[in-house]
């Protein structure tokens, strides 16, 4: 190897980087010489330090390379016996800068090897929970909510292979919706939107809820706070807008603490919010009898 | 290899209804997101709506909700999308695609609505 | 929902020169340090193909003269040396939310 700039790229999946040593043409100057590793996307670098006896004023310098801008992640200082560096990507580079002679560069042997990227934990949705089969490439998450909470977004993420490997979509949410149509409702919960933050103003929200056939419904009011003002909950017993009511917030100061029944399969739950004032809103929970 | 087939073209009246299928083939049905997407003659995408066979999950887009019915059979590994009350604006290719970022296409199936 | 402009509509670009195309979102969908940005390329009787997926990953088996670049709300799609087959519709898409939306596609003719 010649003295002055020098540079080796290396690809295979591991490898070794050794400081040059063939410095037989004398020369005023010092080295400046660039090692290049790439190993295949989805996977990063992993450079493992097994010896190293620089001189004074000497540098080594490494950089994860790959992304939008280089990414440093060691230099001599950091470089003992042992150490351990991973770059986050599939490119890396080791830069060695010796000193002129007479005092002749120092010198190294260091060890990389390819490691598989994985994907980063998923966030685990508030009202909600997540599992993971694996967080490499193929893995996958699976999502789900609190009963009364409904997910927004996709249920089922997959790891990705790429450069940096990455779950196909953001994380979903848990949210309360204002309203819905909750079919062969056996049990569960409904909560009105923001619960249990405070609901927003100027809502109205209709649920129906309708039991299997041949069963009917059993309503409890798990909590029901409401601003005092024109803040109004009405149960209806049947499936629509104009069945008659069993509770009106309006009509009815004390919640009826052994809860509603309804006489067919269908309860409509109707919330209503005006533009001032707002409070926790409602948690009903609901389950099906035999008739 | 990954395998996306429709069904062929298909020529129907106003206000009946369709069901087109995408035959799967070559990777894990279950474990991977079928969509649907519309697009018009000569114009651009639109996303349906999408199914997880494994478990039945759907996901629609608030254009098409009562629109499409989206449905999915594991052991024949085959997708299906139901359209309803259909109208001359529902006439277009409707593609289905392979996972949440679409890395492959049927081959696309033309709906015609017409008296 | 997040909408997606493309430009140009169209382009014509000579025989081994570069084409370059404009997506833009209107609002950033980077998530996680991943942009939820992909590029399809769609030929006339033809289903889309992926080129692109997470602004700068080539989808496999798909030439190394098709590149993306971009994060936030500005991706950008390079072809080059544009060869003739390359003459396509091409569309951005993303995925970061629902409903994954589509650009209006950006029509690339071969002089």
């Known amino acids: 190897q010649t003295p002055g700039p020098c540079s080796w790229n290396f690809s295979g999946p591991e490898g070794s980087l050794d400081s040059p040593t063939d410095l037989s043409s004398p020369t005023d100057v010092g080295l400046d010489c660039f090692f290049y590793i790439s190993v295949y996307p989805g996977y990063g670098v992993e450079i493992k330090v097994q010896n190293i006896s620089l001189r004074e004023g000497e540098t080594v310098t490494v950089e994860g390379l790959g992304g939008p801008d280089p990414l440093p992640l060691a230099n001599q200082s950091f470089l003992l016996r042992g150490q351990v560096i991973r770059s986050p990507t599939h490119q890396a580079a080791l830069r060695f800068q010796s000193l002129p002679p007479p005092a002749g560069p120092g010198t190294f042997h260091f060890h990389y090897q390819a490691y598989l990227l994985s994907c980063h934990f998923p966030r685990r949705p508030a009202y909600g929970d997540v599992t993971v089969t694996s967080l490499h490439p193929g893995g996958s998450a699976r999502f789900h909510c609190a009963t009364g909470y409904q997910l927004k977004g996709a249920r089922h993420l997959t790891c990705l292979n790429a450069t940096q490997p990455f779950w196909d979509s953001k994380e979903p949410v848990c949210i309360a919706a204002c309203g819905g149509v909750i079919r062969n409702a056996t049990t569960g919960r409904i909560v009105s939107p923001g619960f249990p933050g405070n609901y927003s103003n100027n809502l109205t929200c209709h649920w129906l809820l309708e039991a299997p056939e041949g069963q009917r419904l059993h309503l409890h009011f798990e909590k029901v706070s409401l601003a005092e003002d024109d803040d109004r909950l009405i149960i209806r017993n049947g499936d629509n807008v104009e069945a008659p009511p069993v509770y009106d917030s309006y009509e009815v100061e004390y919640l009826p603490i052994e809860g509603l029944l309804s006489s067919g399969k269908h309860f409509f739950v109707e919330l209503s919010t005006d533009s001032s004032g707002a409070a926790a809103g409602m948690a009903l929970r609901y389950e099906a009898f035999q008739q | 290899q990954v395998q996306l087939q429709q069904s062929g073209p298909e020529l129907v009246k106003p206000g009946a209804s369709v069901k087109i299928s995408c035959k799967a083939s070559?990777?894990?049905?279950?474990?991977?997101?079928i969509n649907w997407v519309k697009q018009r003659p000569g114009q651009g995408l639109e996303w349906i709506g999408r199914?997880?066979?494994?478990?039945?999950?759907?996901n629609y887009s608030g254009n098409f909700e009562g629109k499409a019915t989206l449905t999915a059979d594991k052991s024949s590994t085959t997708a299906y999308m139901q359209l309803s009350s259909l109208t001359s604006v529902d006439s277009a290719v409707y593609f289905c695609?392979?996972?949440?970022?679409?890395?492959?296409w049927g081959q696309g199936t033309a709906l015609t609505v017409s008296s | 929902d997040i909408v997606l402009t493309q430009s140009p509509a169209s382009l014509a670009v000579s025989l081994g020169q570069r084409a370059t195309i404009f997506c833009r979102a209107s609002?950033?969908?980077?998530?996680?340090?991943?942009?939820?940005m992909h590029w399809f390329q769609q030929k006339p009787g033809q289903p889309p193909k992926l080129l692109i997926y997470?602004?700068?990953n080539v989808q496999s088996g798909i030439p190394a003269r098709f590149s993306g670049s971009g994060s936030g709300t500005d991706f950008t799609l390079n072809i080059h040396p544009v060869e003739e087959e390359d003459a396509a519709t091409f569309y951005c898409?993303?995925?970061?939310?629902?409903?994954?939306?589509f650009g209006g596609g950006t029509k690339l003719e071969i002089k």
């Open positions: 898409q993303q995925s970061i939310e629902d409903p994954p939306t």
């Open positions: 695609t392979r996972g949440l970022v679409m890395d492959y």
């Open positions: 997470a602004a700068s």
């Open positions: 070559g990777y894990a049905f279950s474990s991977s997101w």
């Open positions: 199914i997880y066979p494994g478990e039945g999950d759907t």
């Open positions: 609002q950033s969908v980077d998530y996680n340090g991943i942009s939820y």
